[in-house]
Interface confidence: low
Amino acid sequence: QNCSGPCRCPDEPAPRCPAGVSLVLDGCGCCRVCAKQLGELCTERDPCDPHKGLFCHFGSPANRKIGVCTAKDGAPCIFGGTVYRSGESFQSSCKYQCTCLDGAVGCMPLCSMDVRLPSPDCPFPRRVKLPGKCCEEWVCDEPKDQTVVGPALAAYRLEDTFGPDPTMIRANCLVQTTEWSACSKTCGMGISTRVTNDNASCRLEKQSRLCMVRPCEADLEENIKKGKKCIRTPKISKPIKFELSGCTSMKTYRAKFCGVCTDGRCCTPHRTTTLPVEFKCPDGEVMKKNMMFIKTCACHYNCPGDNDIFESLYYRKMYGDMA
């Protein structure tokens, strides 16, 4: 338990830590270990998670062997009516593992967040809640309209909507980035957010970007060809300028938007990229905002509800606010 002996580490590579747990050097500076979390037992060899403001509290000075990981006075978080201390991890539901860090809550999805595109063997994929299971699972409805299955659907892909694994290790910081939330508006200018600690201080922060899934003016259903039920990515007729609170984008953009369906499915961005857009305001001020640009859309039954957990929980409170 103490550091008096020589360094001896397991032969296998560094351990894989659960989401939200930092990989750190042990207290002796020898081996990489998964940091102990709030309330767990700690020793000189098994340090507490420094990125969550935790320290090993040994109690009486005489007992310096085993302590308990305790949080300093980082701001707590309020989530679902419960106060969580800084450094505390909790499951907000069976779908999300969350961590409170200095007043900010970051949550990692425990369920796969993939989007399944139609395929010849599964033309109508749909996410359903199965009894006794937390995460929704994909099921395939029987094809009702055989004409839908055609060569256009041959490119079957089951892939993560949100790019590479958001968890990677960098300089004693377990980097975690949640996926971008769905756009707050189904048409017109909205906001999409995510929580990340991918910064120099490994601090959880909320990032936001503008997004437009489709313009509100467009009557897209009129463009759906006879016999079809969806228009996934309508053709853009002309370059447009974006508007934001009376300010107009300085450049024109030939942006892609998502279409609509007439059969209850919704079309949402599937692959996106984030680019800066400069807006000029009537008073001459220029502001630069990050904006989502759509690369591809997908039409599916897994329609977004009002479930962006990050939108409501990021505003921070401290102990004194409870008074």
Epitope: G53, F55, D73, G74, S86, R316, K317, G320, A323
Partner: antibody, heavy 120, light 104 residues
């Protein structure tokens, strides 16, 4: 670089009220707290209270509870501190400070201070 | 919650000044250190016990263990003469009484 600019010096009579303003520029006003700290002549620093503009929630040090009201106007990025039932012991320089609650509360930017003199 | 600081500390130029701040189980709290020069608003030097705010010289460092936090100013200069305050959160913000540093 955030700047906090406070209103000018005030001379008040005992029993009256004073309202000091603190205007923020060059940074995001809403997502931080604005704390008010006072310093009596030749004395140390004393926290009065603070507001988190994005939440509209204020909380106060116990010794000022019931006598102080802190508000914020997000549209003008201005915080206000009103102290009532003034007594001579309230004579002090009142500072506003940006309270970065994301970093466990850092007073990283300060106003220039407003001298409030309570005298009959 | 009470934070106790010595009222004054004197140091020779080029020497190391140590300003202490004591409080019950202080190691369980994050300590900040502020510097205030006469007629000016305070300036934050150190937060989270030992992290320097950007732009603060490396000569300023902080530590916190047990019941005591220490602000260390190495190679003290005449320009370091000021009042120094420690600060913690304990359901409200609490400041130490302040320490006047003299560089003689």
């Amino acid at each position: 670089q955030m700047q906090l600019v406070q209103s000018g010096a005030e001379v008040k009579k005992p029993g009256s009220s004073v309202k000091v303003s603190c205007k923020a520029s060059g940074g995001t006003f809403s997502s931080y707290a604005i704390s008010w700290v006072r310093q009596a002549p030749g004395q140390g620093l004393e926290w009065v209270g603070r507001i988190i503009p994005i939440l509209g929630i204020a909380n106060y040090a116990q010794e000022f509870q019931g006598r102080v009201t802190i508000t914020a106007d997000k549209s003008t990025s201005t915080a206000y501190m009103e102290l009532s039932s003034l007594r001579s012991e309230d004579t002090a320089v009142y500072y506003c400070a940006r309270d970065d609650i994301a970093v466990a509360g850092n007073f990283d930017y300060w106003g220039q201070g407003t001298l409030v003199t309570v005298s009959s | 919650y009470v934070l106790t600081q010595p009222s004054s500390v004197t140091v020779s130029p080029g020497q190391t000044a140590r300003i202490t701040c004591s409080g019950d189980l202080l190691a369980k709290k994050y300590v900040r250190w502020l510097q205030q020069k006469p007629g000016q608003a305070p300036v934050l030097l150190i937060y989270k016990d030992s992290e320097r705010l950007s732009g603060i010289p490396e000569r300023f460092s902080g530590s916190n263990s047990g019941n005591m936090a220490t602000l260390t100013i190495s190679r003290a200069q005449a320009g370091d003469e000021a009042d120094y305050y420690c600060q913690v959160w304990d359901s409200s913000w609490v400041f130490g009484g302040g320490t006047e540093l003299t560089v003689l």
